[in-house]
Amino acid sequence: AIVFIKQPSSQDALQGRRALLRCEVEAPGPVHVYWLLDGAPVQDTERRFAQGSSLSFAAVDRLQDSGTFQCVARDDVTGEEARSANASFNIKWIEAGPVVLKHPASEAEIQPQTQVTLRCHIDGHPRPTYQWFRDGTPLSDGQSNHTVSSKERNLTLRPAGPEHSGLYSCCAHSAFGQACSSQNFTLSIADESFARVVLAPQDVVVARYEEAMFHCQFSAQPPPSLQWLFEDETPITNRSRPPHLRRATVFANGSLLLTQVRPRNAGIYRCIGQGQRGPPIILEATLHLAEIEDMPLFEPRVFTAGSEERVTCLPPKGLPEPSVWWEHAGVRLPTHGRVYQKGHELVLANIAESDAGVYTCHAANLAGQRRQDVNITVATVPSWLKKPQDSQLEEGKPGYLDCLTQATPKPTVVWYRNQMLISEDSRFEVFKNGTLRINSVEVYDGTWYRCMSSTPAGSIEAQARVQVLEKLKFTPPPQPQQCMEFDKEATVPCSATGREKPTIKWERADGSSLPEWVTDNAGTLHFARVTRDDAGNYTCIASNGPQGQIRAHVQLTVAVFITFKVEPERTTVYQGHTALLQCEAQGDPKPLIQWKGKDRILDPTKLGPRMHIFQNGSLVIHDVAPEDSGRYTCIAGNSCNIKHTEAPLYVVDKPVPEESEGPGSPPPYKMIQT
């Protein structure tokens, strides 16, 4: 059987505070617990929710939590169900409300000497006790002319007189707390001799040099006095007018007329009514001078056909608030339809091309009128004038691809090459009309090109294939001067390309035929063994059918390549002595020798007194210093080849001889002695 270890119990609770109804069960099998409120299952909310088996209240609510709660435990498998004892809350609360007139039925019926009853609509549990106030002062029960009924929460004034006039409020307190009236009641019982407002002046806005009228009336017995004052407390009468109010007239009924209003007349006007008794009544009204500022400029707008767009017209600052309307072609727009005005907005629904044009926003008030134009362009999808065509472009010449389109506004054209956007550079240029110029066509320009023409309304694109017509050319052009090593094998290559594969052949410039040991193998001139007679001028001729022939002239020199007869050696010299680095080379043509010391070429004309290069190529350095140490390179070159060899130079301090060493003792390393 299911047994309740803890059952919920009825308890006091405070409105808006936490509470917990406990429930704990013990059962042989698994059970689930749910709660009922007045027999209906309780749904979890953030405010009231199951916490384990118990029911937790984050904030007790006197309306939603009134009733009987019951904890139900159910074994879903067996269907057994057990129910706890019922529990409910005694919820303590207090809630503010207004002070209302209970008797008579309406304020209009309140007359001097009638009974007036006010009710305080503060409620609570337990029932609170009430305190009444007039103009913030507590009213004690049993005072003359009023009675307080706490049970009915009423305050009765009998008979009510002018002395009872004032602001009535109430407060109530109970064990839960306290609250004061949310809305108070102003009781006004007129004293006939007090001035009362019949007609109050209203703020007015007038244009410069127009007239303004303020109305003001009071009533009392006997009749009250009425006086007008301007801002600086200057009285305005028909006999004494301030200098700046020369055109002011006060009428017998109390109205004030101002004619030809100027800026200095703007300000606050006070109408003061004074009865035989009671305080003066001061009514204020302001005279404003109408004004209107300029309107901000519109940016031109581009819209797409078929869409819905809005253009907002911000009215200029002005007094009174300027009215705004839209016009097109001199006609005011309607408030409904396809192109219409909604509030300050121009609305274009399902835009057509014919809607393009100038629309004008007008703003006007008493001070004048302002207008501002907005230019509306209806964008169209571009259409083709000329699509790019598959083209054959000549290598080395400028090439053009057309992309001519038309649309509103003028379309933007971009080009892609192999799906990559072409950015304008020295080789590519896009003209204003969309045509692409390739400044000097190269072989690898033969690919797909795509142009895209766009407006805000959409885009069109087309592509074309470019085929490059290769010019007949040597690839690469043969070097015009070449050397061959005497008595060795040599080759001179010559290759060319063109629209058709060219035929390549060599011939001697003088027209004589090639000797038998020289062969022409598909453009490569082959010398089995170079002789002196092989030197001379040769011509490589490349030709094909459509492009004719081209020639390249080559001067072949036969040379004995450079060899070193004497090479510089690793040298160590005492500081202040002379160093000699020998170098001698041979070859044909006879090689020239240059020296490089410490990574710079030694110019024979700028060597100075310490250095000298001999005719045979040797380098001498006098009075060597430590900074002369380093690697020295001998470079031998002629018109056919160049060769180099290097050796280090070490400059060392001369040792001071010790006594044990005789004058004939050898130095510790190989030296040049000078």
């Epitope: 698994p30 689930h32 299952p41 749904q43 879903d76 498998v77 067996t78 269907g79 169900e81 129910r83």
Partner: antibody, heavy 112, light 110 residues
Framework: EVQLVESGGGLVQPGGSLRLSCTAS????????MNWVRQAPGKGLEWVGI???????YYASWAKGRFTISRDTSKNTVYLQMNSLRAEDTAVYFC??????WGQGTLVTVSS | EIVMTQSPSTLSASVGDRVIITCQSS????????LAWYQQKPGKAPKLLIY???NLASGVPSRFSGSGSGAEFTLTISSLQPDDFATYYC??????????FGQGTKLTVL
Amino acid sequence: EVQLVESGGGLVQPGGSLRLSCTASGFSLSNYVMNWVRQAPGKGLEWVGIIDSSGSTYYASWAKGRFTISRDTSKNTVYLQMNSLRAEDTAVYFCARGLYLWGQGTLVTVSS
Amino acid sequence: EIVMTQSPSTLSASVGDRVIITCQSSQSVYNNNLLAWYQQKPGKAPKLLIYYTSNLASGVPSRFSGSGSGAEFTLTISSLQPDDFATYYCQGHYNGNIYAFGQGTKLTVL
């Protein structure tokens, strides 16, 4: 022995009424919840409603208004009153205590 | 209206196979775990297999197991036996004492 026996099924014309009974033995209804479940021929199980230990009833949305569950604790019997019957109400009607204990079912045929 | 969807509606398998049936609810069940699984054979009343999502009913073999929470649940048969070919139903219990069944999954021999 704890068991449930349904009765009252049979043939009824469309628009007619029928009251099914589920008699419990071996336990007291006042401590248990009782379900009615039906199964149309060749179709799946469909929950009709429940009566809890206090006698409060809850129904599937489609059953509200036409079907009423009640009980007589002195007779230890639960009832299913079915009104305005339609052809689609043809099914075997089971009563069940909790999830575990089920009756053998009674067939209701609605046909003209 | 609460809708409980079982998948698949029909399932063919062989003895020894591992079988998984899923049950998805249009809203969470009470306490996130008040879900039961039944087995029914033709002409018989349904038999309780699993209650409270994963608790095995008395006398049910341990090859049956259940899991899930909230609105998504599964029934697993770890190694199918000849006696297991039947129709399986999930049943949810919802806030407000409302119950609902899935449309059923018919398990047949491959």
